[in-house]
């Protein structure tokens, strides 16, 4: 649902020699870049699994859905999609799995209709803070982006340039307040250990937030209060041990929310009492009957909904496996 899809019809492949012949000139209306498939009817261009090392220069002006997946792009420079005339209709851009390790400031400038962007499965060691905002102004022009898919963009540990990966991604999300209109944000499978305080409050239009399969150990300062439109919150497969009263109250106060909490190592001691009480009453947690204790050992696999206050005593000695994510 979050990637550009095609109502594919009548794809035409170009002859490879065409692209180099006209790359410096405005593209012809029906031209298709080398190694790509194009459907003007579907307004779709697919350059998939072609080992491209750069974005084709001669993309047709009609393109609305552009797939550049499974390539070897390495670097996305400023103005990577800037064309004359501009790609004014490009609404959905999928760059997943294209071995991108650097996205520079202004990489997506001059795409006035870009609503969906998928950068998943790229080892982004260097994501510029201004990748999405385009400029380093404290308040930049609003981005048209509505969906931003950044699943599994964490690079291998030895390529992380000795800085916080969470911080790098968050900086790009917040720069210039450009993404105030963002409705879907997917950040699954990125080894996130934390979210900076109040970061979500700066993305007030969010409807869908996917933080699943990370290593989040606490939500103590993750405020959901301002996210009044939030409909789904995916927190499965993290390292959460307990949710505290403040978080529970904020989630309960969101009018449309569905929360997914499966596969977290819940610690069933006295600190869990409020969460258990809340789970028994709330309708917002999907599959709440599947939530089970991981620690202490005597409570392992007990269903949270079946616990009572007498079951929840302190203080467990936590095993080393719970001490690091």
């Amino acid at each position: 649902s979050s990637s550009p899809t095609s109502s594919a019809s009548s794809f035409s492949s170009s002859a490879p020699f065409l692209a180099s012949a006209v790359s410096a000139q405005p593209p012809l209306p029906d031209q298709c870049p080398a190694l790509c498939e194009c459907s003007e009817a579907a307004r779709t261009v697919k350059c998939v699994n072609r080992n491209l090392t750069e974005v084709p220069t001669d993309l047709p002006a009609y393109v609305r859905n552009l797939f550049l997946t499974g390539n070897q792009l390495a670097v996305l420079p400023a103005g990577a999609f800037a064309r004359r005339p501009p790609l004014a209709e490009l609404a959905a851009l999928n760059l997943s799995g294209s071995r991108l390790d650097e996205v520079r400031a202004g990489a997506f400038e001059h795409l006035p209709s870009l609503r969906q962007l998928d950068l998943s499965h790229n080892p982004l060691a260097d994501l510029s803070p201004f990748a999405f905002s385009g400029s380093n102004a404290s308040v930049s022009a609003p981005s048209p982006l509505v969906e931003l898919i950044l699943n599994h963009i964490v690079p291998p540990e030895d390529e992380r340039q000795n800085r916080s990966f969470e911080g790098m991604v968050v900086a790009a999300l917040l720069a210039g307040r450009a993404l105030q209109g963002l409705r879907r944000l997917e950040l699954a499978s990125n080894h996130f250990l934390y979210l900076p305080r109040d970061v979500l409050a700066q993305l007030p239009s969010l409807r869908h937030l996917d933080l699943s399969n990370n290593s989040l150990v606490s939500l103590t300062y993750v405020s959901f209060r301002n996210l009044t439109h939030l409909e789904s919150l995916h927190l499965e497969d993290n390292a959460l041990k307990v949710l505290h009263n403040g978080t529970l109250a904020e989630l309960q106060g969101l009018p449309h929310i569905r929360v997914f909490l499966d596969n977290n190592p819940w610690v069933c001691d006295c600190h869990m009492a409020d969460m258990v009480t809340w789970l028994k009453e709330t309708e917002v947690v999907q599959g709440k009957d599947r939530l089970t204790c991981a620690y202490p050992e005597k409570m392992r696999n007990r269903v949270l909904l079946e616990l009572n206050s007498a079951d929840l005593d302190c203080d467990p000695i936590l095993p080393p496996s719970l001490q690091t994510s």
Epitope: S164, D198, V217, Q323
Partner: antibody, heavy 118, light 107 residues
Framework: QVQLQQSGPELVKPGASVKISCKAS????????VNWVKQSHGKSLEWIGD????????NYNQKFKGKATLTVDMSSSTAYMELRSLTSEDSAVYYC???????????WGQGTSVTVSS | SIVLTQTPKFLLVSAGDRVPITCKAS??????VAWYQQKPGQSPKLLIY???NPYTGVPDRFTGSGYGTDFTFTITTVQAEDLAVYFC?????????FGGGTKLEMK
């Protein structure tokens, strides 16, 4: 790289005020809280308060309410702390620090020494 | 406010020693504890957050554990450059508070 550059040492008289600056660079200033911490000579650390540069919202340690005022200038990516009605008890090194993981401070300024003496 | 009691105040160590430092909170702070190192004349440096997670670039000889009220910071094999003061901090509730510090000195 991330840097927090604090203003220089201050020698002030009792009863006076002082305003310390902390210029941030190398990261998105509005994305992270700035915390302020006091360290008296040879002592532990005391959290004064924090400020959200995105909206100027502040949290203070009750002990420093009325003593410290935290502000930011987004256009210059600079945080400020003003200390007023100074006494010898306020003589200390004051640090600004960028917050990373919530509440935890991952980058610190070099510290500003404030000496209150007549 | 939450009081953090750090022990010991001083530690005499030899290179290669395993060094544990404890921090006890006056009430539960879940896993919301950080540990810092401060060398003479320098600013503090973040080592561990959320009780057990090493900050980016921190050598793996520095480890943390604990939950609730009792926390331990360990240097598994002390090196000469580890001589410093170490502080715990709770970030569970405002005001954030620090322990009194533990000074590591060489025998």
């Amino acid at each position: 790289q991330v840097q927090l550059q604090q203003s220089g040492p201050e020698l002030v008289k009792p009863g006076a005020s002082v305003k310390i600056s902390c210029k941030a660079s190398g990261y998105t200033f509005t994305a992270y809280y700035v915390n302020w911490v006091k360290q008296s000579h040879g002592k532990s650390l005391e959290w004064i308060g924090d400020i959200n540069p995105n909206n100027g919202g502040t949290n203070y340690n009750q002990k420093f309410k009325g003593k410290a005022t935290l502000t930011v200038d987004m256009s210059s990516s600079t945080a400020y702390m003003e200390l007023r009605s100074l006494t010898s008890e306020d003589s200390a090194v004051y640090y600004c620090a960028k917050e990373g993981p919530p509440g935890a401070m991952d980058y610190w300024g070099q510290g500003t020494s404030v000496t209150v003496s007549s | 406010s939450i009081v953090l009691t750090q022990t010991p105040k001083f530690l005499l160590v030899s290179a290669g020693d395993r060094v544990p430092i404890t921090c006890k909170a006056s009430q539960s702070v879940s896993n919301n504890v950080a540990w810092y190192q401060q060398k003479p004349g320098q600013s503090p440096k973040l080592l561990i957050y959320y009780a057990s997670n090493p900050y980016t670039g921190v050598p793996d000889r520095f480890t943390g554990s604990g939950y609730g009220t009792d926390f331990t910071f360990t240097i598994t094999t002390v090196q000469a450059e580890d001589l410093a003061v170490y502080f715990c901090q709770q970030v569970y509730s405002s005001p954030f508070t620090f322990g009194g510090g533990t000074k590591l000195e060489m025998k």
